[in-house]
Amino acid sequence: QRLPRMQEDSPLGGGSSGEDDPLGEEDLPSEEDSPREEDPPGEEDLPGEEDLPGEEDLPEVKPKSEEEGSLKLEDLPTVEAPGDPQEPQNNAHRDKEGDDQSHWRYGGDPPWPRVSPACAGRFQSPVDIRPQLAAFCPALRPLELLGFQLPPLPELRLRNNGHSVQLTLPPGLEMALGPGREYRALQLHLHWGAAGRPGSEHTVEGHRFPAEIHVVHLSTAFARVDEALGRPGGLAVLAAFLEEGPEENSAYEQLLSRLEEIAEEGSETQVPGLDISALLPSDFSRYFQYEGSLTTPPCAQGVIWTVFNQTVMLSAKQLHTLSDTLWGPGDSRLQLNFRATQPLNGRVIEASFP
């Protein structure tokens, strides 16, 4: 499946490519910053190893039209170059970012800008992608992924963190957005809806897809996530839409078949290593790219978003398993975990193809 290109050549001229807004100095959200009633809020999970202490008992989720989520900020990891393999290696380190970002939730107080002022920034994510307004940029070359093929051992941690299902990735997964734009993958997680309701974060011409995968990467220019937060290009996320298809997706089944084991919020299991790239579309050459933010507090800006034009197909049963298995805080189902689309505010989305 490919996303529709309504027109061949109609790039939107001018505007900002989304320069970084210093944290705490963004404009407050305007009327259009508020999500539409039909757009429940969501999250962008930071790579982390464990929940912050004392944050297990979170209030019950009450659906409202605001964009807040009922979730906890996970620890920011220390990410270093691959070291001596005799030491246990993962991408995580207990490093609390700040108490005021520890408590936030779906559909209720506190408002996200109070949790993190960056959430009121002008260059936020997700956004609605309008292909006919995307600017073709010939400099956007095919993405390069290296080391995404993992043997079954050592196993990987799959966790229900209360607001998504997250797979922590080992060192050595390298991704290049282009020459000199090199990143290391930290974790991947998913966003989804509910029975009969789509749950992707990004939309295309207002169309919301059933689900969306995010693979979160840290620039090789930074050793730690907290150093990269808010810095232009410090973090990069590869995003792909998940759609319903006729056949079971064997790559996703390796994860979806384990969701029952982590139905409870905060639970985790170990899964055999797999081909991480098989969770993404096969066409690395056609994508949309823009500068935005994390889609949950701290909503740090400067994040490079790459949204594949090609979608990934899962069976109806698999999509149902994804949206109907996990539980979040307060005895609520973990569903509709997406943030409303945010205004572009002059940003131009670039396309790697005409």
Partner: antibody
Framework: QVQLVQSGGGVVQPGGSLRLSCAAS????????MSWVRQAPGKGLEWVSA????????YYADSVKGRFTISRDNSKNTLYLQMNSLRAEDTAVYYC????????????WGQGTMVTVSS | QSVLTQPPSVSGAPGQRVTISCTGS?????????VHWYQHLPGTAPKLLIY???NRPSGVPDRFSGSKSGTSASLAITGLQAEDETDYFC???????????FGGGTKVTVL
């Protein structure tokens, strides 16, 4: 000191059984997948079997499937290889090895123990 | 017959540079799986020399380096020394066999 100390090798007749042990110390054994690797006389290294950190998943080379069983006792920091229906071609030095936390490399090895299958 | 193919032997004079090749297929090295290298003195435990294609564990001299391209990998030893005379094995994972696989080994001789 990080080390794997092996025991249990010896001479056994074809069709017989033997149990190898590998005691770990100096690292968090229960956090690591483990493997057995062997080297027949004059031959190269051959992976035999592997087990996940929690013992829930096991893997075997086709040459030993159905005859060998890998297991572990994390409370004792010990890895085992139960070898049944032994054949002459199983004669080798057997090494236990830590699967490491880096993408399948074997980074800590035991000293090896000789298994001879002969009538 | 090993899944990964290495030359049985290579040799070089002290101080020289030697390389050992390791050729696989589309189900192991070519599939994107990492290649690791081990130094093995017969009668002792193998020692991890290179992991993840090109990374050296602490304590391994920088005379040893690894690289990978396509369906093959190579180990280079620069400034060859007498103590480098031993066996070297490459290793990867094979998705078709669902097994960790080794090369047949290469004997390095210092002339």
């Amino acid at each position: 000191q990080v080390q794997l100390v092996q025991s249990g090798g010896g001479v056994v007749q074809p069709g017989g059984s033997l149990r190898l042990s590998c005691a770990a110390s100096g690292f968090p054994f229960s956090s690591y997948a483990m493997s057995w690797v062997r080297q027949a006389p004059g031959k190269g290294l051959e992976w035999v079997s592997a087990i996940s950190a929690n013992g829930g998943t096991t893997y075997y080379a086709d040459s030993v499937k159905g005859r060998f069983t890998i297991s572990r006792d994390n409370s004792k920091n010990t890895l085992y290889l139960q070898m049944n229906s032994l054949r002459a071609e199983d004669t080798a030095v057997y090494y236990c090895a830590n699967n490491g936390n880096y993408r399948g490399a074997f980074d800590i090895w035991g000293q090896g123990t000789m298994v001879t299958v002969s009538s | 017959q090993s899944v990964l193919t290495q030359p049985p032997s290579v040799s070089g004079a002290p101080g020289q540079r030697v390389t050992i090749s390791c050729t696989g297929s589309s189900s192991n090295i070519g599939a994107g799986y990492d290649v690791h290298w081990y130094q093995h003195l017969p009668g002792t435990a193998p020692k991890l020399l290179i992991y993840g294609n090109s990374n050296r564990p602490s304590g391994v001299p920088d005379r040893f380096s690894g690289s990978k391209s396509g369906t093959s990998a190579s180990l280079a030893i620069t400034g060859l020394q007498a103590e480098d005379e031993t066996d070297y094995f490459c290793q990867s994972y094979d998705s078709s066999l669902s097994a960790w696989v080794f090369g047949g080994g290469t004997k390095v001789t210092v002339l």
